[in-house]
Every structure is written in C-alpha cells, then in structure tokens.
C-alpha cells in the first residue's frame, strides 16, 4: 500500500514546538512524501517560499538512507488561486511553457514526482485539466530514459461531489495520473451553522442531502463509480481537526455554532487545530465517538472539535483495504505530534504510525 | 561551474582490467544520472553505460554487459567504470558526462585514453 | 537496438545553409528526444540540440533542429554557415534500455 504523506514548508514558520523543517520526518515512515507548495511564475514552475530550495534538499536527502522513498513536489494550493491556473492551463503556449519547466526543476532540485493541487478547476476549465495532465504525462513519458526513471504525477482531488462534477473527468485523467489523492476531508465547515465531523467514514444518521455525500465512503464510491481504478486512489486521513465556538449548551453533533473554534497556540488559525494541539485540548476534554461515522470529537468548554484519533484511522485504512484501495493519504506529517512531546506517547507521528501499522496488518 | 575530470586510462593487455574515475564537481551530484561515452579514434561516439542519480539503476550497452560496471560514490562526488575482460575493440577515449535535466547530456570531460593492446 | 543514420560529409560556403537528417530505423523518432551534439577536432562533445528543437544557453539561434515523422528522421539546420561550425555533427536519441548515436556527419566549411 501507498502512504503518502504532505508536508507544509509553511509549517517552518510556527513558533516553538511547532515548527517543523523536512529533517524532522521519518525517512521510513510514508512511501511518498510530497512537499507543498511550488509556485507558477511567467507560465514557469518556481519556488514560492525564499529557502525553498535548502528545504527541498533537507527533504530530498531523506532519501539517500531510504532509496525507496519517493518525493514529489505539489504545485497550487490554496493560496496559488483557481483563476492563475486556469490562465495557464487554458492556454495552449502556455501550457506548453509550464509543462516543459517542470522535468528540468523537479530533476534539479531531486524530486521523484509532480502532484498537481489545482484548488479548484471551475466547469470550465474541466477540460483543461483534462489536457493539462494528459500532456504533462506524455512529456514525462518523452522526458524518460535510462538512468533517469519516469517522473510520476499524481493528482489532489476534491472529495465533494459538486466540485467532482464540475471540475474532473474522473475516467480520462485517471489513465494518465500515476495515483489519485482523494481529500476525504472538510466535508463540514463553520459555514453549516452546526457542529459535524470534517472528516466522517461513513453517512451520519441524521444527514439528508446534501450532507448524504458529505463523507468519506461517498466520495470514495463516487469516484470508483465515476472510473477511478481503486488501484491508484489514495484516500485522505487529515492529521487536523476542525473546531467551533459553541453557541449553547448543546454540545452533540448538530449543535447551534457562533463560528470557528479558537485558534490554535501554534498553527493560529480559527477553526483548525493541528493533532498536536488536540493532544494538548484533550487534557480535561470529554470526548465523545461518533458511531455510525466512526469518529471522534472532544468538548472543552463552549469548543468543539472534530478530529481522527488512532482508533479512527485504523478503521479508515481498513475501509480503504476492503475497498482495495491503492492506499492512504496523510494532510500532513507537520500536523500530526511530529516531536512526539505533545500526545503522551513518546512515539513521533503518531497517526501517521497508526495508518503504516494499520496499512501492513495482515 | 560543472567540472567533470576522468582518470585511470592507460594501456593493458586483452583479458586486462582497468577502472576509469570520474570527479564531479560544481553540481548537487546525486540529482544526475551520469554516462560513460566512448569514442573509437577516428570513429563515431557510443554509449557504454548509465547510472541513476542514487546509484540504484545502472544501464549497459550490449557490447560491454557482463564485462563492465558502473558504480558512483555521491559522497565522495565520484562516478566510476570498472572494466574486466578487455578486448582490442574496447580501446577508446572514455568520456564521463553528466545526464542533464533535458534529455541531453550537458557536460561533458575531456576523456581519457584506454588501450588494449599485447 | 535501433540505428541513427547521418549522411557521411556535407560542405557548403561561408554564410549558407546545411541541413543534416538524422533518420531512425525502427521505432518513431518522435516517441523519444532527439539530441545534437558538436565535436570539433580533438575536444569533447557539446550539445547544440536538445529535446527535438530546443537550444541551450550559449549556442546562437542559427542552430535549429526538426522532426519529421512522416519519414521518421530529425533534421539540424545551420544557416549563415561560418568557419567555427566546421565540426562533426551527432544525432542521438534512447529507447527505454539504451542510447543510440547517430553514424556522425562531417561538416567542411568551403573556401
């Protein structure tokens, strides 16, 4: 099975504990490791942050006492806009441009492999996207030789159904992408005005449409139906969980919100809260499981957070092996306890450990 | 600036060993495939043998499969070509080249004289 | 293995134009890059040619190569013909388990 696991080279920037750099992860704990987010500029691929390039190499000489790793490098994100890439891709000269730039950048700097985080195609550009990774894979294909293996292409897809339909044409981009990571997570968000699980398994019992396809198993048989090989979807497992100000004494799921939850003490962004974080919000918490969904939130006060504990991941990755998954996806390693200070266990990545262990039983 | 500067050449008999080095310097040297080129004097160029970046692929022309090997050391920035079983059709100037980002190979040494001669 | 065949010698004047096809034996031309590569006398190779038709840093834009699939070989052109361009001229290309060169061309700069 793949683990592909994303790594932040924003993360760098939290404070204290929670900075991380590429030479804090486990050269042997994903098959993949790709590293978010390279920029677009004058139709060419870049670097976005000033030390990007140190920090490819930190993370590209994990490699030299893991030969087996894998590394890619993830261009877009949400910060890169829909609308640049749309420019890009719609553009014949200058598709063509950014195509030929990349097996030379990702040669130079040592990566294995391009992801594309196009965040999201609109109707529109559902073609584009189509054409982009075609010919991305054709010049990859040319580009090959021996002493010089095949670039891979991978994919971040949206796992809402709206976005599905109008964005990909599962069937043809499936042929040409290596692997397919499916982010089976965000289903809910402050914007629904009630507590819900982010990243639920399965259907909730009380969800009518459209949150029937605001989960996991939806979106994973939606796109099997739609002509992804389950051979190459890689399915989401979020090391983050999604938080909210409670707005009574309710504290279920489906309890009325007045917004996100309070920012975390070192990713300090209302709503979101690293793993590490939960760790440290679990100390005095009441946790409750969600059954039918298969996953955990904690209640501390007027917050609320949903998130995926060791239990949870465990029943995901045996989700994905029932449904012969290619493997897991993990947003991302700088989120989970990376140190292993925060979460009691004296183990670094915990989760992350969690869905290797999960991936290799038997 | 890309250096590359081979070593070893010589002259040896048939059925004689050499090993051809090659010091690279003024690149992120495991990021490279690396190639040994060979040109018969007054003939065209051939393709010997390739290495991948980690050193965990290498490739053979038919003519020297099971007679020579490639390895790279990326510590020491070193590539090199052990040669076994020499024949009087291997005598050449072996040229070290650095496998580019395209498709080309975009430096290239000075190359050093092999030999086999009784 | 697939061949690369060149034509043994052209010669032309100061200031024209040569044109060396490269043309493969088996296989498409266009299903791997084509590279050129320049040896004058007594020097190691350097590239004029990479991927088809591009140039490197360096080398003046009267070096061009083409693809010609319909007869299956790759062409380099250099117009304005000048003395430093007396060389012999490489095609090569690669399948997935070896390199291929060309047979070579000599190019001879009259007068």
């Known amino acids: 099975y793949k683990l592909v696991c994303y790594y932040t080279s924003w993360s760098q920037y939290r404070e204290g504990d929670g900075s991380c750099f590429p030479d804090a992860l486990d050269r042997f704990l994903c098959t993949h490791i790709i590293y978010s987010f390279a920029n677009i500029s004058n139709d060419h691929i870049d670097t976005w942050e000033w030390n990007d390039v140190t920090l490819y190499g930190m993370l590209n000489t994990l490699k030299n006492r893991n030969p087996n790793l894998k590394t890619l490098l993830s261009v877009g994100g949400w910060n890169f806009g829909s609308q640049r890439f749309s420019k890009i891709a719609s553009n014949t000269q200058s598709r063509r441009t950014f195509i030929k730039s990349v097996p030379p950048f990702l040669r130079t700097h040592g990566f294995d492999g391009l992801d594309l985080a196009w965040l999201y195609p609109g109707r529109r550009d559902k073609q584009h996207f189509t054409t982009l990774i075609k010919e991305m894979k054709a010049e990859f294909i040319k580009e090959a030789q021996p002493g010089k293996k095949q670039l891979l292409l991978s994919a971040a897809l949206s796992a809402g159904k709206v976005t599905i339909d109008s964005s990909y044409d599962i069937a043809k981009i499936s042929q040409h992408l290596d692997f397919i990571s499916i982010m089976t997570y965000d289903f809910h968000g402050a914007w629904r005005g009630t507590t819900g699980h982010h990243s639920p398994l399965f259907r909730g019992q009380e969800d009518a449409s459209p949150d029937r396809f605001s989960n996991t198993d939806y979106a994973v048989g939606y796109m099997l139906r739609l002509g992804a090989p389950a051979s190459k979807l890689v399915m989401g497992i979020p090391t983050f969980g999604r938080s909210f100000t409670l707005a009574s004494s309710e504290t279920g799921v489906g309890a009325p919100i007045s917004g996100p939850g309070i920012p975390g003490r070192f990713t300090k962004e209302a709503g979101t809260l690293a793993y590490y974080e939960i760790c440290d919000f679990l100390r005095g918490a009441t946790v409750h499981r969600i059954l039918g969904q298969q996953v955990p939130y904690a209640t501390k006060g007027n917050q609320w957070v949903g998130y995926d504990d060791q239990e949870s991941v465990k029943s995901k990755v045996q989700y994905l092996k029932d449904r012969q998954l290619a493997g897991a996806m993990v947003w991302a390693l700088d989120l989970d306890d990376f140190q292993g200070s925060f979460c009691g266990q004296d183990l670094r990545f915990p989760l992350t450990n969690a869905i290797k262990d999960a991936l290799a039983a038997t | 600036e890309v250096q590359l500067v081979e070593s070893g050449g010589g002259l040896v008999q048939p059925g004689g060993s050499l090993r051809l080095s090659c010091a690279a310097s003024g690149l992120t040297f495991p990021n490279f495939a690396m190639t040994w080129v060979r040109q018969t004097p007054g003939k065209g160029l051939q393709w010997v043998s390739t290495i991948s970046g980690r050193g965990d692929e290498p490739f053979y022309a038919d003519s020297v499969k099971g007679r020579f090997t490639i390895s790279r050391d990326n510590s020491k920035n070193m590539v090199y070509l052990h040669m076994n079983s020499l024949r009087a059709e291997d005598t050449a100037i072996y040229y070290c080249a650095k496998g580019g980002h395209f498709s080309s190979w975009d430096y290239w040494g000075q190359g050093t004289l092999v030999t086999v001669s009784s | 293995n697939f061949m690369l065949t060149q034509p043994h010698s052209v010669s032309e004047s100061p200031g024209k134009t040569v044109t060396i096809s490269c043309t493969r034996s088996s296989g498409s031309i266009a299903s791997n890059y084509v590279q050129w590569y320049q040896q004058r006398p007594d020097s190691a190779p350097t590239t004029v040619i990479y991927?088809?038709?591009?140039?490197p840093s360096g080398v003046p834009d009267r070096f061009s190569g083409a693809i010609d699939s319909s007869a299956n070989s790759a062409s380099l052109t250099i117009s304005g013909l000048q003395t430093e361009d007396e060389a012999d001229y490489y095609c090569q290309s690669y399948d997935s388990s070896s390199y291929v060169f060309g047979t070579g061309t000599k190019v001879t700069v009259l007068g």
């Open positions: 991927e088809d038709i591009e140039r």
